[in-house]
Amino acid sequence: MGCDRNCGLIAGAVIGAVLAVFGGILMPVGDMLIEKTIKREVVLEEGTTAFKNWVKTGTTVYRQFWIFDVQNPDDVAKNSSKIKVKQRGPYTYRVRYLAKENITQDPEDHTVSFVQPNGAIFEPSLSVGTEDDNFTVLNLAVAAAPHIYQNSFVQVVLNSLIKKSKSSMFQTRSLKELLWGYKDPFLSLVPYPISTTVGVFYPYNDTVDGVYKVFNGKDNISKVAIIESYKGKRNLSYWPSYCDMINGTDAASFPPFVEKSRTLRFFSSDICRSIYAVFGSEIDLKGIPVYRFVLPANAFASPLQNPDNHCFCTEKVISNNCTSYGVLDIGKCKEGKPVYISLPHFLHASPDVSEPIEGLHPNEDEHRTYLDVEPITGFTLQFAKRLQVNILVKPARKIEALKNLKRPYIVPILWLNETGTIGDEKAEMFKTQVTGKIKLLGMVEMALLGIGVVMFVAFMISYCACKSKNGK
């Protein structure tokens, strides 16, 4: 009878030990299985979860625009006063709804190439007005012409055309015209076959971004989605030195197993450069734990504050010998037009940049850019890309519309907020397929280990107690 009890207790302890060992073994083995599954599913090839979402994003992406309506155009043109602006918006468009095209796998170098078609659909229900709303904004062609043609002879010619077309420093344009293009009356007088259509994003609809060539991750998962080349080149030819490099991914996803200490590098064709994001905080997105990576102020700093940025300072006059910060001259990438990119409302920009403009209210929460990345898969499940488009206008003695200016202005035209968040259905699916399974496996591991240890300890104590009792 005593033997039966002792045997039962030992058997219980053994079972407990086996469960605990099994639970313990399951930890690295389970992690290995998860890793293997993740590695298999994030590869960019036909049949994987990643590929399906990569070809056509499952997220609805919106681009909201706020236009800076100039309140005192005549005063600025005549007296070189501060420019008073009032932002109007949001005007919302649905973007990135088109699937990637010309997808071609290259099994030799484990890459996949594609183009991303551009398209924008106006969303009246998410906008404060219609595409026909009018704004007073800088005359893009008049401002750009003397910058492109710094030749005083040609400026005299252009002045004749500007006067003939009754153009001036500022113009009134509808939202649709300003964003997507309008026939400029001044450029229309140039007697050569030039493009006479002007718009902040012209041409956009029916155009493509790319060709992008990215690593598919088949041979090395740590390179998945990293851009190998853009438009057939590994460099941009816009910037000197390492600033010209195409680094990282396109920000839609990153190689899996993202750590908080990692700097996420990505390339954005909108700003004609590679940039980076650093860990900001852990947040819960629809029940999915994600890491929020933010663009640090350091990325927009002057070379004085961040020497790594020296090669992004390509001109010395407007940048006050590279001491100004928070604006990026992307003219080289925009056919020589004086386009400057910044954060909305000149967030993180030097005071000299925003000083000539009245009505700006930079706000970290509203105007910063962030990426919410699920750390196991490296997928970006939510993002907010915020940037501002500005045009430099300088005094031009030979152009009457600009001859009264006493200083250069970096004039804000508009700012945009491009956002995408994983849908509720997709989030549920993601939880079921990824985080849910990992949680479940973790719970099973802990349960086995816990139950096993408890059983082993309990049965061993019982066995010892029983033995000492019998010994007496």
């Epitope: 710094q150 030749n151 005083s152 002879f153 040609v154 005299v156 010619v157 002045n159 004749s160 055309l161 006067k163 003939k164 007088l189 140039v190 007697p191 050569y192």
Partner: antibody, heavy 117, light 107 residues
Amino acid sequence: EVQLVESGGGLVQPGGSLRLSCAASGFTISSFGIHWVRQAPGKGLEWVAWIAPYGGDTYYADSVKGRFTISADTSKNTAYLQMNSLRAEDTAVYYCARSFFGYFDYWGQGTLVTVSS
Amino acid sequence: DIQMTQSPSSLSASVGDRVTITCRASQDVSNWVAWYQQKPGKAPKLLISYATSLYSGVPSRFSGSGSGTDFTLTISSLQPEDFATYYCQQHSNAPLTFGQGTKVEIK
């Protein structure tokens, strides 16, 4: 086909006047603007005057300022160079030429102006 | 005014020769330089604009180079019809100014 034809040249006494014409075809002179360039016998080219596009401003070489006047009649698609107080050093072949960005892509055949007593 | 100084003022060369004519501006004119060819009794003909841009219909043996203040017209292989006088011209600032010309003669 773009063509420029000058006329009005000839022999004139010092202090005299002459009006040169430049008839254009194949393009609209108001869109481009017209220049007059001269070449003294055996010498190089010298820019003389310019009327900017769309009846814009007029510009002159210092050597002719106050004596020469450039004008255009858009209805006739013709440019003119009114030359007053002519001097011996104004003797030259006068060309009208088309230009927009400052280089001359089309030239007339030239008309000779001789200032001599 | 911007002075354009051409050199040499004349040169003798044979058919097939490579000929180089230089032009120096008295101040920076960026790439706003044109080159012309003129034959006796004829109007000048545009060869090159913007220092390097070959005008339509001009044979590819003509080429231009330079930026700032120093410019060059090169004829890679001189042909019989190339014997003429060549002028450079800056189209950066008014008044527009020409070089004094380079006469290319048969050796």
